[in-house]
């Protein structure tokens, strides 16, 4: 806390300018009017105030707006935003995408801080859903943003927003998240033709069910092994050797290198060795000839 002292004669600030950087903390407290500061916040960023001086400026704004800053002030906080705590930010009502962008810019190139996470949370809750423009902005600043959301939060993403998602935005998503995103992507891209559709849907396929993989296998998509390895194991297991061969096209040769890893390993165990041999890749571990395969899951469903 800065002691309350009278402003020395001739030092009362008429505007926020460079002369203030030579003021001591107590002079800033005494000589800068909080309302003047609020109306000229845009100037603060251009003035190289010290860390301690910024404490005083924040204190003045906190006193002026105990219930939370108005958006007109928030939009021009600039690097003073880095002084805010999550508790401060929870008092704000940020509705403008321009305000959000201005504050994210200050944190650009750094991982998401608790302040930024709180800001985004307030903004998205205020909007009611993650619309395309917001998602565009957030993934531009934080490529991993989408994968930081819970499946419940992702359910509020409208299919139209999926167009803003780039493959790298999904790199850290787990299967539960892709389970939510895949149906939205399928809906968003449904009017595209085969090859274009596959390019767009490819990053989301970790959430695809068996029937969709079977359908893709009929479209000469030539899925690469990296994508195949990210598919849900339970979706891959029912695929036949012929379907996997069609799905992967020329990439089918890559199965050999992945035969010890999921989902390839588990898929091999479900195939007849005879069928695997038709691939000519030397894949081993299939069901030997003459063995009967009982689908116990089907038996349980019937009883």
């Amino acid at each position: 806390e800065v002691e309350k002292t009278a402003c020395p004669s001739g030092k009362k600030a008429r505007e926020i300018d460079e002369s203030l950087i030579f003021y001591k903390k107590w002079e800033l407290e005494a000589c800068v009017d909080a309302a003047l500061l609020a109306t000229q916040m845009d100037r603060v960023n251009a003035i190289p105030f010290t860390y301690e001086q910024l404490d005083v400026l924040k204190h003045k704004l906190d006193e002026l707006y105990p219930q939370g800053y108005p958006e007109s002030v928030i939009q021009h906080l600039g690097y003073l935003f880095l002084k805010m705590s999550p508790e401060d930010i929870r008092k704000w009502n940020v509705t403008s995408l321009e305000t959000l962008k201005a504050l994210l810019e200050v944190n650009k190139g750094h991982e998401m801080s608790p302040q930024v996470a709180t800001l985004i949370d307030r903004f998205v809750k205020g909007r009611g859903q993650l619309d395309k423009d917001t998602l565009d902005t957030l993934t531009a600043f934080y490529p991993g943003y989408l994968c930081s959301l819970s499946p419940e939060e992702l359910s509020s993403v409208p299919p139209s927003s999926i167009w803003a998602v780039r493959p790298q935005d999904l790199d850290t998503c787990d299967p539960r998240q892709l389970d939510v995103l895949y149906p939205k992507a399928r809906l968003a891209f449904q009017n595209m033709n085969g090859s274009e559709y596959f390019v767009k849907i490819q990053s989301f396929l970790g959430g695809a069910p068996t029937e969709d993989l079977k359908a893709l296998s009929q479209q000469n998509v030539s899925m690469d092994l990296a994508t195949f390895m990210k598919l849900r194991t339970d979706a891959v297991l029912p695929l036949t050797v012929a379907e996997v061969q069609k799905l992967l096209g020329p990439h089918v040769e890559g199965l050999k290198a992945e035969e010890r890893h999921r989902p390839v390993r588990d898929w091999i165990l479900r195939q007849r060795q005879d069928d695997l041999d038709t691939l000519g890749l030397g894949l081993q571990g299939g069901i030997p000839n003459g063995y009967l395969v009982l689908d116990l899951s089907m038996q349980e469903a019937l009883s």
Partner: nanobody, 118 residues
């Protein structure tokens, strides 16, 4: 690890000149501003001169027209040219830099002593 190392201080006669240097190392972020502070014996540390990333300079009233701050962006070095020195200029001079992107942080050097004898 950011390090600021000052040099160029010493004993000088009133009316004389000195040039302080501050070599900055370990900087992996855009610097918002560099500055020089002076701490006279028994007093608080006061800002003397500051230069922003764009090259804008500002000076305390007591040194205007006598001191000049400059920076060499290639070598990450900041200078303070001090002319017409008086006994009032005696003190420890600290180099300082501001980080304002990603985090708010001020970095300081260890200081260099300047003594002006009359």
């Amino acid at each position: 690890q950011v390090q600021l190392v000052e040099s160029g201080g010493g004993l000088v006669q009133a009316g004389g000149s000195l040039r302080l240097s501050c070599a900055a190392s370990g900087i992996t972020f855009p610097v918002n501003a560099y500055g020089w502070y002076r701490q006279a014996p028994g007093k608080q540390r006061d800002l003397v001169a500051i230069i922003s990333a764009g090259g804008t300079t500002n000076y305390a009233d007591s040194v205007k027209g006598r001191f000049a701050i400059s920076k060499d962006n290639v070598n990450n070095t900041v200078y303070l040219q001090m002319n017409s020195l008086t006994s009032e200029d005696t003190g420890v001079y600290y180099c300082y830099l501001q980080r304002r992107i990603g985090m708010l942080r001020d970095y300081w050097g260890q200081g260099t002593q300047v003594t002006v004898s009359s």
